[in-house]
């Protein structure tokens, strides 16, 4: 469970461990937002190739405000979404290449969060209540993770202690502000 155990209401764009996010539509073809591919590091993959651009584990940056119940962060935070499959583009399924990519009895490589960072944010709440702070867990970098066809999804949950997502330590929040409300705010933040 790790960080999963802490409900991170304001980072609902970050998937549960074992899930793989797709960037919001606005980001998909927005090259200006894609400041770093593979985090500037050689991609983790099993294929021999001289053209790194053929590999599609991308780190897409976007900015959003953190919401927590009726409160909102004073400043926006910038975080990453890991996007794409991990393999040469020519080997990916046709079209967009978001489908599961299996080789017969071979491994599957997925683009998933590699490292996380926690950022403390000050929250502005109605009524001038006591100063409040919250820590949000943000993806710091992405990597390709091998998953053989014989492994289940839990094999992906190898993020180590940092994966423990203290999402719990937050203040109560009205049900009305669910994933969709936060998603809408996120989309308005670009």
């Amino acid at each position: 469970q790790g960080w999963q155990a802490f409900k991170n209401d304001a980072t609902e764009i970050i998937p549960e461990l074992g899930e793989y996010p797709e960037p919001p539509p606005e980001l998909e073809n927005n090259k200006t937002m894609n400041r770093a591919e593979n985090g500037g590091r050689p991609p983790h993959h099993p294929f021999e190739t001289k053209d790194v651009s053929e590999y599609s584990c991308r780190e897409l940056h976007f900015t959003r405000y953190v919401t927590d119940g009726q409160c909102r962060s004073a400043k926006p935070v910038t975080e990453l979404v890991c996007s794409g499959q991990c393999g040469p583009a020519r080997l990916l399924p046709n079209a967009i290449g978001r489908g599961k990519w299996w080789r017969p009895s071979g491994p599957d490589f997925r683009c998933i969060p590699d490292r996380y960072r926690a950022q403390r944010v000050q929250l502005l709440c109605p009524g001038g209540a006591a100063p409040r702070a919250r820590k949000v867990r943000l993806v710091a970098s992405c990597k390709c993770k091998r998953l053989t066809r014989f492994h289940n999804q839990s094999e992906l949950k190898d993020f180590g202690p940092e994966a423990a997502r203290p999402q719990k330590g937050r203040k109560p929040r009205p049900r009305a502000r669910g994933a969709k409300a936060n998603q809408a705010e996120l989309e308005n933040a670009y």
Partner: antibody, heavy 118, light 107 residues
């Protein structure tokens, strides 16, 4: 699995100090806030304060100001709460609790009974 | 300090009963209220936060409502494992304070 494991029970004399430890596992200590809450025998819960292990920031309840010190050893993911000038009314179970905000308590340690008696 | 007053302080109920516990704040706390369950010899467990948001893993028979000064915790159909003491806690103003607790006993 997020776990908080606290140190064992303590018996102290009035005027002495006690230091309770809270070892966390399953996540990185600096990614959360650490809270301390106490409960006198048969009584309710009382918030003592919180600390931010990442930067050493803290907020103590005014009732404990000057007597309580909350620290962390981030290399071992262990938090500490020291209470000085103990008196009999400090006899209580002391809990560490963690969360990603300063205002609610998501995971709790099992508690440490501190008995202050002459 | 904000005083949190729970009522009743104790109640007796049977399995299957609908149970309601109230918590009143001495001043408005918006919806910054959490509910905890504590069993004898154990640490409290978070049930609800932001007055009405169910903590992950908590059964849906638990629900919370209210805003401002008056809040309610409801257990729609009491189960054997629900016999415990329940505390409300305000997270709006320092120092954070708890209610005195409501002990739910078997009738």
């Amino acid at each position: 699995q997020v776990q908080l494991v606290q140190s064992g029970a303590e018996v102290k004399k009035p005027g002495a100090s006690v230091k309770v430890s809270c070892k966390v596992s399953g996540y990185t200590l600096t990614h959360t806030f650490m809270h301390w809450v106490r409960q006198a025998p048969g009584k309710g819960l009382e918030w003592m304060g919180w600390s931010d292990p990442e930067i050493g920031d803290h907020e103590y309840a005014s009732k404990f100001q000057g007597r309580v010190t909350m620290t962390e050893d981030t290399s071992t993911d262990t938090a500490y709460m020291e209470l000085s000038s103990l008196r009999s009314e400090d006899t209580a179970v002391y809990y560490c609790a963690t969360g990603d905000t300063t205002y609610k308590f998501d995971y709790w340690g099992q508690g440490t009974l501190v008995t202050v008696s002459s | 300090d904000i005083q949190m007053t729970q009522s009743p302080s104790s109640l007796s109920a049977s399995v299957g009963d609908r149970v309601t516990i109230t918590c009143r704040a001495s001043e408005g706390i918006h919806d910054a209220l959490a509910w905890y369950q504590q069993k004898p010899g154990k640490a409290p467990k978070l049930l609800i936060y932001w007055a009405s948001t169910l903590e992950s893993g908590v059964p849906s028979r638990f629900s919370g409502s209210g805003s401002g000064t008056d809040f309610t915790l409801t257990i729609s159909s009491l189960q054997p494992e629900d016999f415990a003491t329940y505390y409300c806690q305000q997270g709006d103003t320092l120092p954070y304070t708890f209610g005195g607790g409501t002990k739910v006993e078997i009738k």
